[in-house]
């Protein structure tokens, strides 16, 4: 029950996170005009990954796309790439995790397959979240650098008479959405990985008793449908005490761990 809850919660958190990453990527307010020097500006500038916008106090907003690809800063291209990779990985992760959910029955899919899929989607969510956090952080770093550079040459004058105020940009709402969304996707991914451990049928989950017949050992495992002579390639006569405590030299074969329904 706890495993299902953890898996379900991980899925929901990741879903919210990825939706947030998509929203952040599409948002225009990655950087917004700093109003510190002019809080009553009649023209407000803000920029996204795909276009820049100008909102006039009259109520009119005009947005222009970045129609050039080669003319854009390498950092912006890198941020775009990170965000897209994050979205793609997240979307694939969501698709995989839907089939991995314990509450959804698909044919005669074994728990081993579900465990593997849960782990795969968890890793995808973690990488997706990291991509988003990295992308947003790179952009934020770029903003901070440009902010202090433009502050250094804030006013350039002609004989001290005419002032040209350089527009400075600060963190926009999309950055915070991206950070939170990336964090949620990361947390969701971690939860999926934790759920995977619970889905995987470990021997330690069961108390096992060995009944010795003449010449060979047959281990009857309560809760399982299969009785086997030992586990995997381990055919040594060995008593299993205290829930299947094992010696270090014993071979663990993972496929056989998951071979019951």
């Amino acid at each position: 029950m706890a495993v299902t809850a953890c898996q379900g919660l991980g899925f929901v958190v990741s879903l919210i996170g990825i939706a947030g990453i998509i929203a952040a990527t599409c948002m225009d307010q990655w950087s917004t005009q700093d109003l510190y020097n002019n809080p009553v500006t009649a023209v407000f500038n803000y920029q996204g990954l795909w276009r820049s916008c100008v909102r006039e106090s009259s109520g009119f907003t005009e947005c222009r796309g970045y129609f050039t690809l080669l003319g854009l800063p390498a950092m912006l291209q890198a941020v775009r790439a990170l965000m897209i990779v994050g979205i793609v990985l997240g979307a694939i992760g969501l698709l995989v995790s839907i089939f991995a959910l314990k509450c959804i029955r698909i044919g005669s899919m074994e728990d081993s397959a579900k465990a593997n899929m849960t782990l795969t989607s968890g890793i995808m969510f973690i990488v997706s979240g990291l991509c988003a956090i990295a992308g947003v952080s790179v952009f934020a770093n770029m903003l901070v650098t440009n902010f202090w550079m433009s502050t250094a040459n804030m006013y350039t004058g002609m004989g001290g008479m005419v002032q040209t105020v350089q527009t400075r940009y600060t963190f926009g709402a999309a950055l915070f959405v991206g950070w939170v969304a990336g964090g949620l996707t990361l947390i969701g991914g971690v939860m999926m990985c934790i759920a995977c451990r619970g889905l995987a049928p470990e021997e330690t989950n069961y108390k096992a008793v060995s009944y010795h017949a003449s010449g060979h050992s047959v281990a009857y495992k309560p809760g399982g449908f299969k009785a086997s002579t030992g586990f995997g390639s381990n055919t040594k006569n060995k008593k299993i005490y205290d829930g299947g405590a094992r010696t270090e030299d014993e071979v663990q074969s993972y496929p056989s761990k998951h071979d019951y329904v």
Partner: antibody
Framework: QVTLRESGPALVKPTQTLTLTCTFS????????MSWIRQPPGKALEWLAT????????YYLDSLKDRFTISRDISKNQVVLTVTNMDPADTATYFC???????????WGQGTTVTVSS | DIQMTQSPSTLSASVGDRVTITCKSS????????????LTWYQQKPGKAPKLLIY???TRESGVPSRFSGSGSGTEFTLTISSLQPDDFATYYC?????????FGGGTKVEIK
């Protein structure tokens, strides 16, 4: 078509409060800013106040912002300018105008002349 | 506040003349976001409300004759009337639309020579 019409008292005594109303039609208020501008006799135009299209922001001339209040009444399609503590220096023709693209004022009312005298 | 200085304050011209009015601002009116200059030109006749001629320094308002043109960038702007018509004798104002307060220039009165 777009029309704007200012209304208010023609004569006001010093220290009194002036309330000017701009009634408009032909456009949706939420899409445009609305401004008040005045022109003392024989002098240049002077911008006084603006209320943004959404109504969230109001802007005033710094020297007069303590005395001026701009507000709107969406249901009546009106923008109201209230001026407290009127002074003879406030004698002017008051215009209301619609603020459009480029923050330019594309439509103006005919203006209302206000004289401040005891 | 941005100060707007217009010159000349009065201009005498004849019908058919090419007229140029200059407007200077104390700060740049060029917005880096869209590379547009937030300067507007108005025409006002005695006893009438001002009429919008040009916004964004060079964009002519619809219905305004093509003889009116605006140019300039940053802090220096000009309004040009290519061939003065009898209907053009009026006072012209430039206005800063970039930053509040939205200051007007002192005006240029174009009168018959």
């Amino acid at each position: 078509q777009v029309t704007l019409r200012e209304s208010g008292p023609a004569l006001v005594k010093p220290t009194q409060t002036l309330t000017l109303t701009c009634t408009f039609s032909g456009f949706t208020f939420s899409s445009y800013g609305m401004s008040w501008i005045r022109q003392p006799p024989g002098k240049a135009l002077e911008w006084l106040a603006t209320i943004s299209g959404g109504g969230s922001y109001t802007y005033y001339l710094d020297s007069l912002k303590d005395r001026f209040t701009i507000s709107r009444d969406i249901s009546k399609n009106q923008v109201v300018l209230t001026v407290t503590n009127m002074d003879p220096a406030d004698t002017a023709t008051y215009f209301c105008a619609r603020q459009s693209r480029g923050n330019a004022m594309d439509y103006w009312g005919q203006g209302t002349t206000v004289t401040v005298s005891s | 506040d941005i100060q707007m200085t217009q010159s000349p304050s009065t201009l005498s011209a004849s019908v058919g003349d090419r007229v140029t009015i200059t407007c200077k601002s104390s700060q740049s009116l060029l917005n880096s976001g869209n590379q547009k200059n937030y300067l507007t030109w108005y025409q006002q006749k005695p006893g009438k409300a001002p009429k919008l001629l040009i916004y964004w320094a060079s964009t002519r308002e619809s219905g305004v004759p093509s003889r009116f043109s605006g140019s300039g960038s940053g802090t220096e702007f000009t309004l040009t009337i290519s061939s003065l018509q009898p209907d053009d004798f009026a006072t012209y104002y430039c206005q800063n639309d970039y930053s509040y307060p939205l200051t007007f220039g002192g005006g240029t009165k174009v009168e018959i020579k």
